[in-house]
Each structure stands twice: as C-alpha cells, then as structure tokens.
C-alpha cells in the first residue's frame, strides 16, 4: 500500500525550531503560522462517502504522523 502523504504539522517537527501544535510551517514564507491561515485539509464529516473537495491530505493524515505516515523533518528556519 502506498505510504500516505506527509504532514508539515508542527507536532511532526523536531528541534531546533519546531512549530507549536496549533501552527503549521509555511514553505513560502519559511516560518510557522496559524494552521487556519493555510487552509489545511478539513476532516470529512462522519459517514461522508464522497471524496473531500481538496486533495491535500486524507482526514486521518491531517493531524500529524499517523500509522504508515512518516513524520516530516522540519529543521530550523532557512
């Protein structure tokens, strides 16, 4: 089975300068910002059968490193 896409969530990030859990690393500005500003994937409602409108992450992958998902290394700001 193909490994799921990785996450840029703060909780996946090791030291030295990780994002806090409520923040996500924005590659375009190269620092941590509130995850809501980046339109992170929203979990599907329970029982929903149609695919989510966005294609970024599946719901179970949107909250950090889960089963079968490698944690994303986030070094300090470039």
């Amino acid at each position: 089975m193909r490994r799921g896409p990785r996450s840029l969530r703060g909780r996946d990030a090791p030291a030295p300068t990780p994002c806090v859990p409520a923040e996500c690393f924005d590659l375009l500005v190269r620092h941590c910002v509130a995850c809501g500003l980046l339109r992170t994937p929203r979990p599907k409602p329970a029982g929903a059968s149609s695919p989510a409108p966005r294609t970024a992450l599946q719901p179970q992958e949107s909250v950090g490193a889960g089963a079968g998902e490698a944690a994303l290394p986030l070094p300090g700001l470039l």
Partner: antibody, heavy 118, light 111 residues
Framework: EVQLQESGPSLVKPSQTLSLTCSVT????????WNWIRKFPGNKLEYMGY???????YYNPSLKSRISITRDTSKNQYYLQLNSVTPEDTATYYC????????????WGQGTSVTVSS | DIVLTQSPASLAVSLGQRATISCRAS??????????MNWFQQKPGQPPKLLIY???NQGSGVPARFSGSGSGTDFSLNIHPMEEDDTAMYFC?????????FGGGTKLEIK
C-alpha cells in the same frame, strides 16, 4: 465546495492595462494563497504571482515591473492588473489556489481568454 | 527559476496500453522529505486538473490508472491502461519554490 470565477474584458488594446477579477465562493481569501496563471496560445503555462492570506504578494520576476495583484476581502475577490500590455500577453488567464502542505493547485477557475489587439 | 523539461512533446498510445511521460527538473524539487512535483491534465476549453501531487499522490477523484513516481530531479507520470478519455495535454509543475514553473506539456493521443 470552493469555486473560483474569472471575469474581465476579453479584448484589450496594446499599451493599455489588463484588469481581471477572481471571485471566490466557498472559502475565504483571508486563508491560503490566491494565484494567477496564464496559458499562451502555444500551450505554455506561466505562473504570474499570488496574494496571500495576509495580503502579501509575490510576482514572477519576468512580470514584476508590470503586474499588481490586490484583493477586497469584503467581496472575497482578488484582482490582476497587467500594465503596458502587448500582443504577447494574449492568453487564457486562470485564477487558482493550492492545497497545503504540498502547494499543488487543486482549485482553478474556468479561465478567461484575453486578446491584446488594436 | 527551476526549469522543467518534459518529454516527449507528443505521444500516441493504443487503448489499453501504457503511456509514460517524463519530467526533468534543472535542480532538485525535494524539500523536507517531500517531492514538490505535481501533474496536471488539461482538455480544450477546460482549466488544468490536478492528477498527482507531491510526486505520487492521487488528486481527488482521479482514477487509479494515473500514477506518479520519482524524486529529486526525475519524475514520471504513468497512465495504464490508456482510455479514450485520457486524450489531453499533460503538464508537470514544481511547487518547491516560487516562481512555480511548468513543463512544456505533452500532447497525448490515441494510436
């Protein structure tokens, strides 16, 4: 579902300013990145620039002296202005928004065709 | 800017067979363990449709016959089995750094 819709004149005279609007429904332009891309008649795609959740902008250096991207958050619209156009700016113009964290553009408008001609 | 070189420029494949399109980047598009390479399909009069993101992940609603692979500078899009509906232009695009750039496109037709 998020939808983007471009609007603006289909014909612009050389040396004038091309002005387009992207109207966004289903999400707020105060989150994410909001982009302009164009496709030339020969099938080449060119990335033009973005306006971000904070209102900051990035412009492709190839267009930097001529381009401006602005927004009106109250209308949930963002805009493209391209100054001093020439026939080489004839293209189909798209607005688009990328996913996170992969920055792959999965939302696109239908595109609007603009011809620069006198 | 990162230059993406797509090949071939055009391709004709028989129904049911495999189509392979390649994309080479002038420098690595990998960052933070992710390959920031995406593939789009575009049909006349329509906007590009995201097929594959982050090199190998299928976009929403994309059929399983579309797959992507690669890392660093060399990537490929595979379509198997080829279907009539797959006749279109295909573009690779990097989202590692701005200005985001596109390949020159591959026109895929049925043989």
């Amino acid at each position: 579902e998020v939808q983007l819709q471009e609007s603006g004149p289909s014909l612009v005279k050389p040396s004038q300013t091309l002005s387009l609007t992207c109207s966004v429904t289903g999400d707020s332009i105060t989150s994410g990145y909001w982009n302009w891309i164009r496709k030339f008649p020969g099938n080449k795609l060119e990335y033009m620039g973005y306006i971000s959740y904070s209102g900051s902008t990035y412009y492709n250096p190839s267009l930097k002296s001529r381009i401006s991207i602005t927004r009106d958050t109250s209308k949930n619209q963002y805009y493209l202005q391209l100054n001093s156009v020439t026939p080489e700016d004839t293209a189909t113009y798209y607005c688009a928004s990328p996913n996170y964290p992969f920055y792959a553009m999965d939302y696109w408008g239908q595109g609007t065709s603009v011809t620069v001609s006198s | 800017d990162i230059v993406l070189t797509q090949s071939p420029a055009s391709l004709a494949v028989s129904l049911g067979q495999r189509a392979t399109i390649s994309c080479r980047a002038s420098e690595s598009v990998d960052n933070y363990g992710i390959s920031f390479m995406n593939w789009f399909q575009q049909k006349p009069g329509q906007p590009p449709k995201l097929l594959i993101y982050a090199a190998s992940n299928q976009g929403s609603g994309v059929p399983a016959r579309f797959s992507g692979s690669g890392s660093g500078t060399d990537f490929s899009l595979n379509i198997h089995p080829m279907e009539e509906d797959d006749t279109a232009m295909y573009f690779c695009q990097q989202s590692k750094e701005v200005p985001w750039t596109f390949g020159g496109g591959t026109k895929l037709e049925i043989k």
